[in-house]
C-alpha cells in the first residue's frame, strides 16, 4: 500500500520518463545556479513536499538528489541563512520502511546524518548545517536540479 506522497512521487517520475528525449543541457538556463555538473534552482517561496516535487517537474527538473556528503556540503555552502530549510528529493517509503530518493534508489546510511524520525509522511530537508526529517506537509522552500551533460574532451574545474 503506497502513501499519497509515494504515489505522487511515482506518478511524476513516470510522466517525466514518458516525455520525449531532449538534447543534453550544456549550460545552466536563466536563473539556475551551476554547482559542478548540476544546475540548481533555490526557491524563495514555500510549499509542502509534494507541491515542491510538482513545481520542479513543471520545470523539467527534479527535487535535488544528493550523491554523497561532499555534494551535500557544496550545496549547503550555497544556503545563505542558517534558519532556512529546503526540501530535497528524499522521503520515507512506508512500504519499504526506508528512506527513498525520488529516482527510486534507497539512501545509503553513510551519506546523510538525518536529524529526526524515519516514519510515515516524513520528508527530508536540508539547512546550511544539517539534514532534517520533517512532516511532508510542512511548508518550506525547496531546491530543484537539472543535470548538465558532460562534454567529452573538456575538463571543467569545480564551480
Amino acid at each position: 500500500q503506497k502513501s499519497s506522497i509515494e504515489k505522487c512521487s511515482v506518478d511524476i517520475q513516470q510522466s517525466r520518463n514518458k516525455t520525449t528525449e531532449r538534447p543534453g543541457l550544456l549550460n545552466c538556463p536563466i536563473y539556475w545556479q551551476q554547482l559542478r555538473e548540476k544546475c540548481l534552482l533555490f526557491s524563495h517561496t514555500v510549499n509542502p513536499w509534494n507541491n515542491s516535487l510538482a513545481d520542479c517537474s513543471t520545470k523539467e527538473s527534479s527535487l535535488l538528489l544528493i550523491r554523497d556528503k561532499d555534494e551535500l556540503i557544496h550545496t549547503q555552502n550555497l544556503i545563505r541563512d542558517k534558519a532556512i530549510l529546503f526540501w530535497i528529493g528524499l522521503n520515507f517509503s512506508l512500504s519499504e520502511k526506508n528512506w527513498k530518493w525520488i529516482n527510486g534508489s534507497f539512501l545509503n546510511s553513510n551519506d546523510l546524518e538525518i536529524r529526526g524520525d524515519a516514519k510515515e509522511n516524513s520528508c527530508i530537508s536540508i539547512s546550511q548545517t544539517s539534514v532534517y526529517s520533517e512532516y511532508c506537509s510542512t511548508e518550506i522552500r525547496w531546491i530543484c536540479q537539472k543535470e548538465l551533460t558532460p562534454v567529452r574532451n573538456k575538463v571543467y574545474p569545480d564551480s
Epitope: 536563466i30 545556479q33 533555490f42 524563495h44 517561496t45
Partner: antibody, heavy 121, light 108 residues
Framework: QVQLQESGPGLVKPSETLSLTCTVS????????WSWIRQPPGKGLEWIGY???????NYNPSLKSRVTISIDTSENQFSLKLTSVTAADTAVYYC???????????????WGQGTLVTVSS | EIVLTQSPGTLSLSPGERATLSCRAS???????LAWYQQKPGQAPRLLIY???SRATGIPDRFSGSGSGTDFTLTISRLEPEDFAVYYC?????????FGQGTRLEIK
Amino acid sequence: QVQLQESGPGLVKPSETLSLTCTVSGGSISYYYWSWIRQPPGKGLEWIGYIYHSGSTNYNPSLKSRVTISIDTSENQFSLKLTSVTAADTAVYYCARDGGIVGATGGFDYWGQGTLVTVSS
Amino acid sequence: EIVLTQSPGTLSLSPGERATLSCRASQSVSSSYLAWYQQKPGQAPRLLIYGASSRATGIPDRFSGSGSGTDFTLTISRLEPEDFAVYYCQQYGSSPITFGQGTRLEIK
C-alpha cells in the same frame, strides 16, 4: 513592504564609468534576482543584467563587455558599473527585484523610482 | 534573443471600453514566462501579469492575460481613466530578458 532606492551621479562624462547603487529595504536580498533596467528618454525598456545573492550574474550580451553588477548582502545593496559610456547610454536607470521562475512568481515585482543619468561633457 | 513585437503601437479607446493588446514573440517563450507592465509618465513600470496569466498582487481583476508559445494577449475588460498608459510585455524564459517596444493606450 520591499523598497528599492537608486543612488549615484546624474551626470557622467563620455568615456568615463557610470556607477549606481541600489539599496533594498523591507525585505531580504537572499534568493531573489536583482536587476538593472534602463530606459532612454521617450523610448522602451532594456534589461542590463541581474545578480543573485551568491554573486552569480547574468548580463545582456549587448552590454556584457562594459557591465559589472556586484552585491553586498551585509548592506542589502547591489551596484552597477558601466564603462566607456557614450551619449547613447543616457537613460533613466531602474533597479528591480526579479522573482525568477520559482513557484507562483515571475517578473520584476518591485522597482526603484529610477534615476536619470545623462552622459555629456 | 527573443524579440517581442507589440501591437498596435497606439490604441485609442474611451473609458468603459474593452482593450486588447497583443504581444508576439519571435520564438516560443519557455513555460509561458511572460509578464505585462503598465507605465505612466515619470513613474517606474508596475507589474500587472506574470506567467502569462497570473495577476500580480493588488492588480484589479479587470486586467487579464492569456496566451502561450508565441502569442500573448493582455485584456482590460472595462477601461478606467487611470488605465491610460504605456504597456510593455516582457519574456523571462531565456536569456537575455527582453521587452516589447510598448503599446500606448490613449483616451479617444
